[in-house]
C-alpha cells in the first residue's frame, strides 16, 4: 500500500492511493489531510485521534459508508471538512458536535434521504459554507435541518428529488449571501422563496423545469428583501411561466441583476407582463445576462415589444450564444439607459445590424461587443455604428473580415477597438487615429506601421512580427503585449525609444541569443520591472547550443563575442 506524502508545513496528500482504511501513523503535525478517491469505507473512533491540529480534512469519493459517532472528536481545530460523493446513507449529529471551528462543510452527493433524525449543525457557529443533498434520494427538507445556523456565506442544496419541504425550514438562517438551489421542478419554489426572502442576497436556481410555474401571492408581511441577484441556470421556461415569474419581482425591490444561463424557452417571446406594477418594480434592475438561451422555435420569435418598457432602465445587457440575428430598431430605441451591450457568439450580419443601430438606438451606449458574429466588412460596420454618439469601446473580434480598406468611418468618441482573431493580414488607416487601446492579437500580421498618436495600449500577441514596431508610431504607449510572434531581438535603443512604456510582454518569441542581446539583458537588471513573465518566458531559439535556455541564464561564448 502506498503511503501519504507530506510537506514541511503539514499538508499531506493521500489521494488515489488505494487506501482501504485511514492510514496509520497520522500525527499532530498534520495541518491538512486529503484522502480523496480511495476505498476507505469505514472511519473508526481512533482513526483520526492523533490529528489534534488538523485544519483541513478532505475525504471525497472514498466510498465511506460508516463513520463512528466519535470519529471526529479530537478535531476541534478543523475548519474544512469534505465528505462529498461517498456512500453515507444516514448522517449523525454526533460527528459534528466537536467541530466548533468548522467553516466549510460539504456533505453533497451521499445517498441520504434526509439530514438526519436530529439537527446536525447546532454547534457549528463558525460555519460559512454548507453543501448538502444529492440527485436521487434527498427528498425532504425539514424545520429542524438548519437549526443553529444563523449566517452563511454560501449554502448549496441539491434537492433534485424533493418530495416535501416543510414550511419555514430555511427561515431560521437569517443571512445567506449566496444560496444555490438545485430543484428539478417548481413545486416548492413559492414556499422556499417566501422563507428566504429576508435573508438571501444572491439566489441561484439550477436545473429547474419552470414550465408549470404559477404565481400565487406569498404569505409574507411587508419585507425589505436584501436580494440583489437572481440567476437561473439550466432552467426551462415558457412564455406563460415567464410572465408568472415576473410577478415575484414585486417582493425583491432591491434586485439589480438577473441572469439566465443555459436555459430553454419553449415559447415565442409572446410575453405579457400584465401587471403594470411589475414594470415599475424592475426599476432597480441594471444588469441582464443571458447566455446559451435555447429557443427551439427561434425563427418564429416575437419582436419583444411587450417587454420594451421593462428594460428602459437597464444599463448592462449580455445576450451571448443565443442565435440573435436582430435587435429591432424600436427595441434599441427603448433601451435608453443602456451603457453596455454584449451580443457575442450570435448571428448578426451588417444588414440587420443596420436596423438594430438605427437613428436613436441605444443613445447611452458606451461599450458594444459583437465578437464572433457574422460580420464581414469593417468599413460597413464602422459606418453603421456612426449613430452611436457615445460609443467609446467596440469589440468586433472573432469575425472574419474582408481585407480592410484604406479609410473607414467610426463613432467619433471611440477609444477602444478589439480586432483580435479576425484574420487580418495588414493594418491600414481604416483604423481610427483616436484609439487609446487597440487589440489586434491572433491575426496574420507580419508588420505594423500605423501612426496612432493617442495609443496607450497595443495588444499584438500571436502574430508574425519579426521586430518590435517602431516606437515613433506610438508616442504615448504605456503597454505593449507582443508574445508569440517571431521577434528575434530587442535592444536598449529600441526600448529606450518608447518614452512612456511601463509594461512589455514579449515572451515566447524566437530570440536569437546574440552577443548584443545577451550583454544587454545582463547589464539591465531593471528589465524585470518592465518585462512581464521575465525571465521564464524569454528563451533562446538560437544558436543551437543555447536553444531552450532562459535569456537571463544564457552566457555568450567569449570567442564569439570578442572577435
Amino acid at each position: 500500500q502506498e503511503s501519504l506524502s507530506c510537506d514541511a508545513s503539514g499538508v499531506c496528500d493521500g489521494r488515489s492511493r488505494s487506501f482501504t482504511s485511514i492510514p496509520s501513523g497520522l500525527t499532530a503535525a498534520m495541518k491538512s489531510l486529503d484522502l480523496s478517491f480511495n476505498k476507505i469505507t469505514y472511519i473508526g473512533h481512533g482513526d483520526l485521534r492523533a490529528c489534534a491540529n488538523l485544519q483541513v480534512l478532505i475525504l471525497k469519493s472514498s466510498r465511506i459508508n460508516t463513520i463512528e459517532g466519535d470519529a471526529f472528536y479530537s478535531l476541534g481545530s478543523l475548519e474544512h471538512l469534505d465528505l462529498s460523493d461517498n456512500h453515507l446513507s444516514s448522517l449523525s449529529s454526533s460527528w459534528f458536535g466537536p467541530l466548533s471551528s468548522l467553516k466549510y462543510l460539504n456533505l453533497m452527493g451521499n445517498p441520504y434521504q434526509t439530514l438526519g433524525v436530529t439537527s446536525l449543525f447546532p454547534n457549528l457557529t463558525n460555519l460559512q459554507t454548507l453543501r448538502i443533498g444529492n440527485v436521487e434520494t434527498f427528498s425532504e427538507i425539514r424545520r429542524i435541518d438548519f437549526a443553529g445556523l444563523t449566517s452563511l456565506n454560501e449554502l448549496e442544496i441539491k434537492a433534485l428529488s424533493l418530495r416535501n419541504y416543510q414550511s419555514q425550514s430555511l427561515k431560521s438562517i437569517r443571512d445567506i449571501h449566496h444560496l444555490t438551489l438545485h430543484l428539478s421542478e417548481s413545486a416548492f419554489l413559492l414556499e422556499i422563496f417566501a422563507d428566504i426572502l429576508s435573508s438571501v442576497r444572491y439566489l441561484e436556481l439550477r436545473d429547474t423545469n419552470l414550465a408549470r410555474f404559477q404565481f400565487s401571492p406569498l404569505p409574507v408581511d411587508e419585507v425589505s428583501s436584501p436580494m440583489k441577484k437572481l440567476a437561473f441556470r439550466g432552467s426551462v421556461l415558457t412564455d406563460e411561466s415567464f410572465n408568472e415569474l415576473l410577478k415575484l419581482l414585486r417582493y425583491i425591490l432591491e434586485l439589480s441583476e438577473v441572469e439566465f444561463d443555459d436555459c430553454t424557452l419553449n415559447g415565442l417571446g409572446d410575453f405579457n407582463p400584465s401587471e403594470s406594477d411589475v414594470v415599475s418594480e424592475l426599476g432597480k434592475v441594471e444588469t441582464v445576462t443571458i447566455r446559451r438561451l435555447h429557443i427551439p422555435q427561434f425563427y418564429l420569435f416575437y419582436d419583444l415589444s411587450t417587454v420594451y418598457s421593462l428594460l428602459e432602465k437597464v444599463k448592462r445587457i449580455t445576450v451571448e450564444n443565443s442565435k440573435v440575428f436582430l435587435v429591432p430598431c424600436s427595441f434599441s430605441q427603448h433601451l435608453k439607459s443602456l451603457e453596455f451591450l454584449d451580443l457575442s457568439e450570435n448571428l448578426m450580419v451588417e444588414e440587420y445590424l443596420k436596423n438594430s443601430a438605427c437613428k436613436g438606438a441605444w443613445p447611452s451606449l458606451q461599450t458594444l461587443v459583437l465578437s464572433q458574429n457574422h460580420l464581414r466588412s469593417m468599413q460597413k460596420t464602422g459606418e453603421i455604428l456612426l449613430t452611436l454618439k457615445n460609443l467609446t469601446s467596440l469589440d468586433i473580434s472573432r469575425n472574419t473580415f474582408h481585407p480592410m480598406p484604406d479609410s473607414c468611418q467610426w463613432p467619433e468618441k471611440m477609444r477602444f477597438l478589439n480586432l483580435s482573431s479576425t484574420g487580418i493580414r495588414v493594418v491600414k488607416t481604416c483604423i481610427p487615429q483616436t484609439l487609446e487601446v487597440l487589440d489586434v492579437s491572433n491575426n496574420n500580421l507580419d508588420s505594423f506601421s500605423l501612426f496612432l498618436p493617442r495609443l496607450q495600449e497595443l495588444y499584438i500577441s500571436r502574430n508574425k512580427l519579426k521586430t518590435l514596431p517602431d516606437a515613433s508610431l506610438f508616442p504615448v504607449l504605456l503597454v505593449m503585449k507582443i508574445r508569440e510572434n517571431a521577434v528575434s531581438t530587442f535592444s536598449k535603443d529600441q526600448l529606450g525609444s518608447f518614452p512612456k512604456l511601463e509594461t512589455l510582454e514579449a515572451g515566447d518569441n524566437h530570440f536569437v541569443c546574440s552577443c548584443e542581446l545577451l550583454s544587454f539583458t545582463m547589464e539591465t537588471p531593471a528589465l524585470a520591472q518592465i518585462l512581464v513573465d521575465w525571465p521564464d518566458s524569454y528563451l533562446c531559439d538560437s544558436p543551437p547550443r543555447l536553444h531552450g535556455h532562459r535569456l537571463q541564464d544564457a552566457r555568450p561564448s567569449v570567442l564569439e563575442c570578442h572577435q
Epitope: N134, L160, S161, S184, N209, R233, T264
Partner: nanobody
Framework: EVQLVKSGGGLVQAGGSLRLSCAAS????????MGWFRQAPGKEREFVAV????????DYASSVKGRFTISRDNAKNTVYLEMTSLEPEDTAVYYC???????????????WGQGTPVTVSS
C-alpha cells in the same frame, strides 16, 4: 414521442471499459433530460447519471462518480455512458431514460429504453 434504442453492453473484465449508447428517434431529443439507470439481479433500479438538455450539466451517483461519464450529441440524437475502471458490483442491466425533469428519481422519467446487460467478471 421519443423511442430509445440502446447498444454497447456485454461482458468485460474488472478494470475494463465499456461505452453504452442510446439513440432516440423523433426530432425532439434536445428537449429531454436524459438519464441512465441500472438494475442488478434481485435489487431495485438505481440511478447512475443524468445530463441536461444542452449537455452543460451532469450529475452522477456517488458509486460511479469519477469512473463513468455521461454525454450527449444532440445532432445525432444520442446519449452515451462511458464506463471505466469497471467493478463486479457494476454488473446490471442498464437503461437509458428521457424526461422533462433533471433528477435522479426514476419515477419522473416518461420514456425508457429496453435495457442492455453489462457483466463485469473478476
Amino acid at each position: 414521442e421519443v423511442q430509445l434504442v440502446k447498444s454497447g453492453g456485454g461482458l468485460v473484465q474488472a478494470g475494463g471499459s465499456l461505452r453504452l449508447s442510446c439513440a432516440a428517434s423523433g426530432r425532439t431529443f434536445s428537449r429531454y433530460i436524459m438519464g441512465w439507470f441500472r438494475q442488478a439481479p434481485g435489487k431495485e433500479r438505481e440511478f447512475v447519471a443524468v445530463i441536461n438538455r444542452s449537455g452543460g450539466s451532469t450529475d452522477y451517483a456517488s458509486s460511479v462518480k469519477g469512473r463513468f461519464t455521461i454525454s450527449r450529441d444532440n445532432a445525432k440524437n444520442t446519449v452515451y455512458l462511458e464506463m471505466t475502471s469497471l467493478e463486479p458490483e457494476d454488473t446490471a442491466v442498464y437503461y437509458c431514460a428521457a424526461g422533462e425533469y433533471y433528477t435522479g428519481s426514476s419515477s419522473r422519467y416518461d420514456h425508457w429504453g429496453q435495457g442492455t446487460p453489462v457483466t463485469v467478471s473478476s
